[in-house]
Amino acid sequence: SAPSSSVPSSSTSPAAFLASGSAQPPPAERCPAACECSEAARTVKCVNRNLLEVPADLPPYVRNLFLTGNQMTVLPAGAFARQPPLADLEALNLSGNHLKEVCAGAFEHLPGLRRLDLSHNPLTNLSAFAFAGSNASVSAPSPLEELILNHIVPPEDQRQNGSFEGMVAFEGMVAAALRSGLALRGLTRLELASNHFLFLPRDLLAQLPSLRYLDLRNNSLVSLTYASFRNLTHLESLHLEDNALKVLHNSTLAEWHGLAHVKVFLDNNPWVCDCYMADMVAWLKETEVVPDKARLTCAFPEKMRNRGLLDLNSSDLDCDAVLPQSLQTS
């Protein structure tokens, strides 16, 4: 149905209306002035309206809420707490705002929130309890099933302590929010693309046992040595395209081999085809885990550039070649 036009806020709240004892039917649900509302579709869109905060008078029927492209910089605790609560809100899209800070308990009082998108916000301060709601060592489980955090890395000049240290701090901040109090143990989809991640914090994934889909594409991951996928027994899709991976070691390959349903996507990484690649090549030739394995080609050394990994033999893989300086750190 067509979006309802915005109705000016009435001074009488629904609760006050009922208490007045009037027998008149309640008015149609209000729609905030900067939004478009469709009760039939249970959708409210407040898009590109330069909003500085979450509208106060959101209709309680809302199931899908789009608050994209606004000017909100801080999401305070209880930003969506309403009376009556927004009990039916399932999908909340806050992408493309200017959010720098998401406070502890920002999403409290949203018992049905299944999908949250905070992408394209320069988050310098993501509270460890943003998704947990409390600082208990084991908090009540969040209802979240899908968490979309693509491109939430702040620009370099907004990160703490310069570039490398700032990235480590940023990764640690995101990891802390994801593991806090085991709140996200029901999360099945996590997107963390385009965040300049250099490494995966060791225990990032340990607290997310229900994950089926993990998107880490377009980061700067050089190695997966310290990451553990062992606990992700339900993992079906792992996207690692467009990173800086040079080789995969036996420990990682063995973990993937132990995951029953997983598909791993590895295209567009600068594979270094030297003697350290032998285990990975042998594994690739045997595995069904990597759907795009025929697309994987060597980037270095120069004499091997563009050579398909699946065609390599151990005799092709030596460690005599000089690598570019940028590839000599592991």
């Epitope: 377009n218 467009d242 567009n268 025929a294 080609t297 980037a299 550039r305 563009n306 050579r307 398909g308 699946l310 065609d311 390599l312």
Partner: antibody, heavy 116, light 107 residues
Framework: QVQLQQSGAELMKPGASMRLSCKAT????????LEWIKRRPGHGLEWIGE????????NYNEKFKGKATFTAETSSNTAYMQLTSLTTEDSAIYYC?????????WGQGTTLTVSS | DIQMTQSTSSLSASLGDRVTISCSAS??????LNWYQQKPDGTVKLLIY???SLHSGVPSRFSGSGSGTDYSLTISNLEPEDIAIYYC?????????FGGGTKVEMK
Amino acid sequence: QVQLQQSGAELMKPGASMRLSCKATGYTFTGYWLEWIKRRPGHGLEWIGEILPGRGSTNYNEKFKGKATFTAETSSNTAYMQLTSLTTEDSAIYYCARGGRDFDNWGQGTTLTVSS
Amino acid sequence: DIQMTQSTSSLSASLGDRVTISCSASQGINNHLNWYQQKPDGTVKLLIYYTSSLHSGVPSRFSGSGSGTDYSLTISNLEPEDIAIYYCQQFSKLPYTFGGGTKVEMK
């Protein structure tokens, strides 16, 4: 050194089919993607698709599915592209190139003219 | 498909000039960009791969730069043998796509 030698120019009638060849020397033929590219005046370069000879894996540009088919004969280090149901739109120069992430060696091109 | 646009279809320059050819992608391509030279006789050569790496045997007067959606090829000191059509090509996503080409001519 790497060389890709393509078959000679062809004049074909509309509705016919034809097969272009590309013979590779100077490298491990099975280990690199072999690309096919179309060049028409006013249209620049268009990627048709690719084949990995050692495995027979192929990727096609959706636009050329049903028009082009790639095969490779590893015994002779030769790749082939079959073009079917030729029309005047298929008149072009067709290149093969050694591929992967970049196309670092190109054949000299085969000119195909489709005319009644 | 990712569209590649070379906004200048042809340009004239003098010997020794610095020539810059631009190329833009319809979405971010993560530096997955190559540059090719097509000579008047139809031969095609790779010049630059992965945005800025000079292919072996290519003169150092050629250089590439860019990021995100915007890329460029620079010829620092134009020589007669540089008369050609220059194409950019993305390899970020299949199908690979080329720009429309920029023809470099002598004044």
